[in-house]
């Protein structure tokens, strides 16, 4: 029975050209995590595992960067950018748990910071 | 350098059994996950099998489930895959297969071939 | 289970063409496709992985691209060697699937 649950930083905004964290956290569940991959639409940004380490796509190497944790740095960020990305556990026993976070990178310099695990 | 050497093939008559055994080198075994893949002679490619690396929990193909077990001993850097209740349809070539980030196949055995046949 | 087809099933070109192999997935598979080259009597090698990084070792010629259901394998101008099978591969979910194999022969 999977128990757990994924807190997110939800929707949140930046400006163009700086930088953001996209955090999760797996709460509620004793399961092991194994890896979380990071996805962008479509996309697989970024993988994280217990045993190997992180590998960020070749095509991302640029402007994502590892952590801080299990999280996932997007840099010099572009309109583009602005999207849905997705946060996936895989856990053992419990299998896989999903979370989803929306950024929005806007033109100009009235981005919210009230995101909690956004850079202030 | 990695490597990755099956064997255990062989003829064995329908019914019967056979342990494949994939022996690795040149990289840290327990971190990765590994699968068994098959090809039949002159037909495509085809999974069968899947285990972890760190917890051991496995995956198989519909058409080998309840008849094969994956297995791997990190201690002695092998994988392995028995087989039993073989039936004619299982006789392909046999690979292993390491599997980083459970994503893409990197390396690959050279193969063991195994008949199932009377 | 997700079901991947490949086309064409085979093809005939000649050294220096630019060959495009396709491969589609029955339902979305974000960018967790591989492709692999076959040669015969010789275990399959890795080409590209999740869908447009290419491998360690692997000639630039060969590039990959596609998301969700639709994917392609691009090699830019054949080359003697290339004369093989290719197989795309889904790794989104158990069971894994491949396509039935593109056989690129020479004209």
């Known amino acids: 029975m999977m128990t757990g649950t994924i807190e997110t930083t939800g929707n949140i905004s930046a400006e163009k050209g700086g930088s953001i964290i996209l955090q999760c956290h797996l709460s509620s569940t004793t399961a092991q995590v194994t890896q979380v991959n990071w996805e962008q639409q479509d996309q697989l940004l970024a993988i994280c595992n217990a045993d190997l380490g992180w590998h960020i796509s070749p095509s991302f190497k640029d402007r994502v960067a590892p952590g801080p944790g299990l999280g996932l740095t997007l840099q010099s960020l572009t309109v583009n950018d602005t999207g849905e990305y997705f946060c996936i556990y895989h856990t053992y026993p419990d299998g896989t748990y999903t979370g989803r976070i929306f950024l929005e990178v806007l033109e100009s310099s009235v981005a919210e910071h009230g995101a909690r695990f956004q850079i202030p | 350098e990695v490597q990755l050497l099956e064997s255990g093939g062989g003829l064995v008559q329908p019914g019967g059994s056979l342990r494949l055994s994939c022996a690795a080198s040149g990289f840290t075994f327990s971190s990765y996950s590994m699968h068994w893949v098959r090809q039949a002679p002159g037909k495509g490619l085809e999974w069968v099998a899947s285990i972890s690396g760190s917890t051991s929990s496995s995956s198989y193909a519909d058409s080998v489930k309840g008849r094969f077990t994956i297995s791997r001993d990190n201690s002695k850097n092998t994988l392995y895959l028995q087989m039993n209740s073989l039936r004619a349809e299982d006789t392909a070539v046999y690979y292993c297969?390491?599997?980083?980030?459970?994503?893409?196949?990197?390396?690959w055995g050279q193969g063991t071939l195994v008949t199932v046949s009377s | 289970d997700i079901q991947m087809t490949q086309s064409p099933s085979s093809l005939s070109a000649s050294v220096g063409d630019r060959v495009t192999i396709t491969c589609r997935a029955s339902?979305?598979?974000?960018?967790?496709l591989n492709w692999y080259q076959q040669k015969p009597g010789k275990a399959p090698k890795l080409l590209i992985y999740?869908?447009?990084s290419l491998q360690s070792g692997v000639p630039s010629r060969f590039s990959g691209s596609g998301s969700g259901t639709d994917f392609t394998l691009t090699i830019s101008s054949l080359q003697p060697e290339d004369f093989a099978t290719y197989y795309c591969q889904q790794s989104y979910s158990t069971p894994l699937t491949f396509g039935g194999g593109t056989k690129v022969e020479i004209k």
């Open positions: 297969a390491r599997v980083p980030y459970d994503v893409w196949m990197d390396y």
């Open positions: 339902q979305s598979i974000s960018s967790y």
């Open positions: 999740a869908a447009s």
